[in-house]
Interface confidence: medium
């Protein structure tokens, strides 16, 4: 990747990621420098007849660093603080090739939940206020609500009116997704409204 447009790489929190390195064709590589947020991470000197010399210069990430045969960087047990800018400089006798990456650490989405605040009107129409959430959501998580394949909301929240006298049974599905995972959770309007109706008639007695 040219330094102008870094390759965006998604890593999953706690898992491993590889930043792929491409070599200049047919040129002998003198050394490779890997940088993280402009700070030296590792210095590699390849050898044709023996194992390469690898000098890890960042002790913080050092134990979690590895390199493939082609000197691509592998980072394991990813942490949120691994997010940032990575660069690899390949130096040959005649030139220096720069590869840039932006690593983004995303959480595998977990524990999708729907909370419901509903009310029953005197005309027996049920109004559902549904809120969808996932554990540790951030700005990279998008939510949407669907019913019968149609998008009803592009937010974690959905407000719908449901009339048991004229509406057929209806499921509403919340879909939460980020670049590495997606989750869905469906609720039945009929079931939710029946629950509200029971509460409503209980309190009226």
């Amino acid at each position: 990747q040219s330094s102008l447009t870094p390759l965006m790489v998604n890593g999953i929190l706690g898992e491993s990621v590889t930043l792929p390195l491409e070599f200049p064709a047919g040129e002998k590589v003198n050394f490779i420098t890997w940088l993280f947020n402009e700070t030296s991470l590792a210095f590699i000197v390849p050898h044709e007849t023996k194992s390469p010399e690898i000098h890890v210069t960042n002790p913080k990430q050092g134990k979690r660093l590895n390199f493939t045969q082609s000197y691509s960087l592998q980072l394991s047990n990813l942490k949120m603080e691994d997010t940032g800018s990575y660069r690899a400089q390949i130096s040959t006798k005649t030139s220096a090739k720069l590869s840039s990456y932006t690593l983004r650490i995303l959480r595998q989405l977990r524990n999708i939940q729907v909370t419901n605040h509903s009310q029953l009107f005197q005309n027996m129409t049920c109004e559902l206020h549904l809120t969808c959430s996932v554990e540790d959501a951030d700005d990279n998580v998008s939510f949407r609500w669907e019913a019968l394949g149609n998008t009803l909301s592009s937010q974690p929240n959905l407000t719908v009116s449901w009339d048991p006298r004229i509406s057929s049974e209806q499921d509403y599905t919340c879909i939460a997704e980020n670049a590495v995972s997606n989750l869905s959770f469906s609720v039945s309007a009929q079931k939710l409204c029946e629950d509200v109706k029971i509460q409503y008639t209980d309190t009226k007695m």
């Epitope: 998008s142 609500w145 009803l152 937010q155």
Partner: antibody, heavy 118, light 108 residues
Framework: QIQLVQSGPDLKNPGKTVKISCKAS????????MNWVKQSPERGLKWMGW????????TYADDFKGQFAFSLETSATTAYLQINNLKNEDTAAYFC???????????WGQGTTLTVSS | EVVLTQSPTTMAASPGEKITVTCSAS???????LHWYQQKPGFSPKLFIY???ILASGVPARFSGSGSGTSFSLTIGAMEAEDVAAYYC?????????FGAGTKLELK
């Protein structure tokens, strides 16, 4: 049918403030977030961010933090973009656009042309 | 941010000519999150093709979209006068959301 109607063109002096409105109709306003997009000849279409129309939470793109503010008048199904301390480079067309599912810009307002000049 | 590079920047085509506009992403994009917009002079952009290949309502069948990963394209089977416009690709999976710089299509 779904419509987004924006306020008219505006001419402002540098250092002043402008507030652009976007009136939504034809759908449940609080179910769909509202994006704001800037279009200029120099930089093309740039996403400024969006506001959650249910809880009012704005999200700003990095280039639009500080000087810009999104707000709502939910009862009037209207979203607002306020630009403070206007600069010449704020001269552009500004669009509101309704979010929808995996499509971020399903419906667009007609645009508001802002000219900043002394 | 993810950079979307469109080519060509400007293109003049004769009526009936087949046209292909490409959109190259600096990072792989799920096909569900790559969309195309058409903008005619003096108007706002309009959703044109969404999720890589689905034509928006009212879009003529001579248009099609395809692609995956980092390479996407919009094709017009046979250019017509009403197709004169700018076409923008847009990705919606990485924040910030980004647009290509646009391809301006003109009539020869």
């Amino acid at each position: 049918q779904i419509q987004l109607v924006q306020s008219g063109p505006d001419l402002k002096n540098p250092g002043k403030t402008v507030k652009i409105s976007c009136k939504a109709s034809g759908y449940t306003f609080t179910n769909f977030g509202m994006n704001w997009v800037k279009q200029s000849p120099e930089r093309g279409l740039k996403w400024m961010g969006w506001i959650n129309t249910y809880n009012g939470k704005p999200t700003y793109a990095d280039d639009f933090k500080g000087q810009f503010a999104f707000s709502l008048e939910t009862s009037a199904t209207t979203a607002y973009l306020q630009i403070n301390n206007l600069k010449n480079e704020d001269t552009a067309a500004y669009f509101c656009a309704k979010r929808g599912g995996t499509v971020d810009f399903g419906y667009w307002g007609q645009g508001t042309t802002l000219t900043v000049s002394s | 941010e993810v950079v979307l590079t469109q080519s060509p920047t400007t293109m003049a085509a004769s009526p009936g000519e087949k046209i292909t506009v490409t959109c190259s992403a600096s990072s792989p994009i799920s096909s569900n999150f790559l969309h195309w917009y058409q903008q005619k002079p003096g108007f706002s952009p309009k959703l044109f093709i969404y999720r890589t290949s689905i034509l928006a309502s009212g879009v003529p069948a001579r248009f099609s979209g395809s692609g995956s990963g980092t390479s996407f394209s919009l094709t017009i089977g046979a250019m017509e006068a009403e197709d004169v416009a700018a076409y923008y690709c847009q990705q919606g999976i990485y924040m910030p959301l980004t647009f290509g710089a646009g391809t301006k299509l003109e009539l020869k």
